[in-house]
């Protein structure tokens, strides 16, 4: 009885079960009653990361530079070439097909993760008793000054974008 | 052991036919494809044709040569393969041996062969 | 079909001898070739398969090698029961066929 179903890293075809090529070869024949599946190894720049029957390997990704991208990680016959951003730059997608400025956390916010080649800056509002004056990609959230340890009083209050102003205590009872 | 014995050759006239058999022992006969190659007095090898074992329906395969006039059937009850040859030509003469055809799709090979028997076809 | 074309069609040896045989294929057969040793009145016996594989209990003075289209059977050191016609077989495709013959003989 020919075959309905094949084994694991197996494909069925003209009621035979064939091996399936390992990964970093492609397909150049199908396998027969006699003769075993033929594969080829892909070449320098192509890679298959799957067993596979696929007739053609993938090219490697281009990291274009024009779109700020660069080598992270070689391809191989068998895995992809990874992508990153140049500094100050991040992916803007999974996929890093392309790259953009990180931004930078506004005034009443501080950096709460750094970006990196693939994330954005991640911001949070600065909670009371902290502040952010600066647009920055790097800058935390400072705590206001503290006017006691200085034996200063407060003479102005801070807010999420200014720190305290200190003054001198009052003398006069 | 792993045998084969041919039988049933002769002398017979064009356009005539003839049964030849090959017994098999020694080894579970229907799990195994089963060919029938010839050679021509002082010639090399020919291969005439193979049928299938159980797991593959018994069917059947020719050369170009015989297709038609040949039939290849095998009695697994028996352990015997037969070759039924009619219209018998001239060239058709030679040593007819049954060889067992072995191996898996890293290479498939005839791995035992019988004695051979001799078919001379002349009027 | 596939044409086996064997050479030489016979040589001359003496025990001891390296003989070297050549069978070169129509096509590329992909490894799918068998070696044969017929002596007279006998019957064929397979001595490789799949261009390097020696059956059982052939002697390793045998040995395959080849690819693609080419392939040849080295016997290293020739031994006297080694006279005999030797045959290549194509595997890869329906209908199989043969080489010529190599015929060793005792020079």
């Known amino acids: 009885e020919p075959p309905t179903a094949c084994r694991e890293k197996q494909y069925l075809i003209n009621s035979q079960c064939c091996s399936l090529c390992q990964p970093g070869q492609k397909l150049v024949s199908d396998c027969t009653e006699f003769t075993e599946t033929e594969c080829l190894p892909c070449s320098e720049s192509e890679f298959l990361d799957t067993w596979n029957r696929e007739t053609r390997c993938h090219q490697h990704k281009y990291c274009d530079p024009n779109l700020g991208l660069q080598v992270q990680q070689k391809g191989t016959s068998e895995t992809d070439t990874i992508c990153t951003c140049e500094e100050g730059l991040h992916c803007t997608s999974e996929s890093c097909e392309s790259c953009v400025p990180h931004r930078s956390c506004l005034p009443g916010f501080g950096v709460k993760q750094i970006a990196t080649g693939v994330s954005d800056t991640i911001c949070e509002p600065c909670p009371v008793g902290f502040f952010s004056n600066v647009s920055s990609a790097f800058e935390k959230c400072r705590p206001w000054t503290s006017c006691e340890t200085k034996d200063l009083v407060v003479q102005q209050a801070g807010t999420n974008k200014t720190d305290v102003v200190c003054g001198p205590q009052d003398r006069q009872r | 052991e792993v045998q084969l014995v041919e039988s049933g050759g002769g002398l017979v006239q064009p356009g005539g036919s003839l049964r030849l058999s090959c017994a098999a022992s020694?080894?579970?006969?229907?799990?195994?494809?089963m060919s029938w190659v010839r050679q021509a007095p002082g010639k090399g090898l020919e291969w005439v044709g193979f049928i299938r074992n159980k797991a593959n329906g018994y069917t059947t395969e020719y050369a170009a040569s015989v297709k038609g006039r040949f039939t290849i059937s095998r009695d697994n009850s028996k352990n015997t393969l037969y070759l039924q040859m009619n219209s018998l030509r001239a060239e058709d003469t030679a040593v007819y041996y049954c060889?067992?055809?072995?191996?898996?799709?890293?290479?498939?090979?005839?791995?035992?062969w019988g004695q051979g028997t001799l078919v001379t076809v002349s009027s | 079909d596939i044409q086996m074309t064997q050479s030489p069609s016979s040589l001359s040896a003496s025990v001891g001898d390296r003989v070297t045989i050549t069978c070169r294929a129509s096509?590329?057969?992909?490894?799918?070739l068998n070696w044969y040793q017929q002596k007279p009145g006998k019957a064929p016996k397979l001595l490789i398969y799949?261009?390097?594989r020696r059956d059982s209990g052939v002697p390793s003075r045998f040995s395959g090698s080849g690819s693609g289209t080419d392939y040849t059977l080295t016997i290293s050191s020739l031994q006297p029961e080694d006279f005999a016609t030797y045959f290549c077989q194509q595997g890869k495709t329906l209908p199989w066929t043969f080489g010529g013959g190599t015929k060793v003989e005792i020079k």
């Open positions: 799949y261009t390097s």
């Open positions: 096509q590329d057969i992909r490894n799918y």
């Open positions: 060889a067992r055809y072995g191996g898996l799709r890293q290479g498939w090979y005839f791995d035992v």
């Open positions: 020694g080894f579970t006969f229907s799990d195994y494809y």
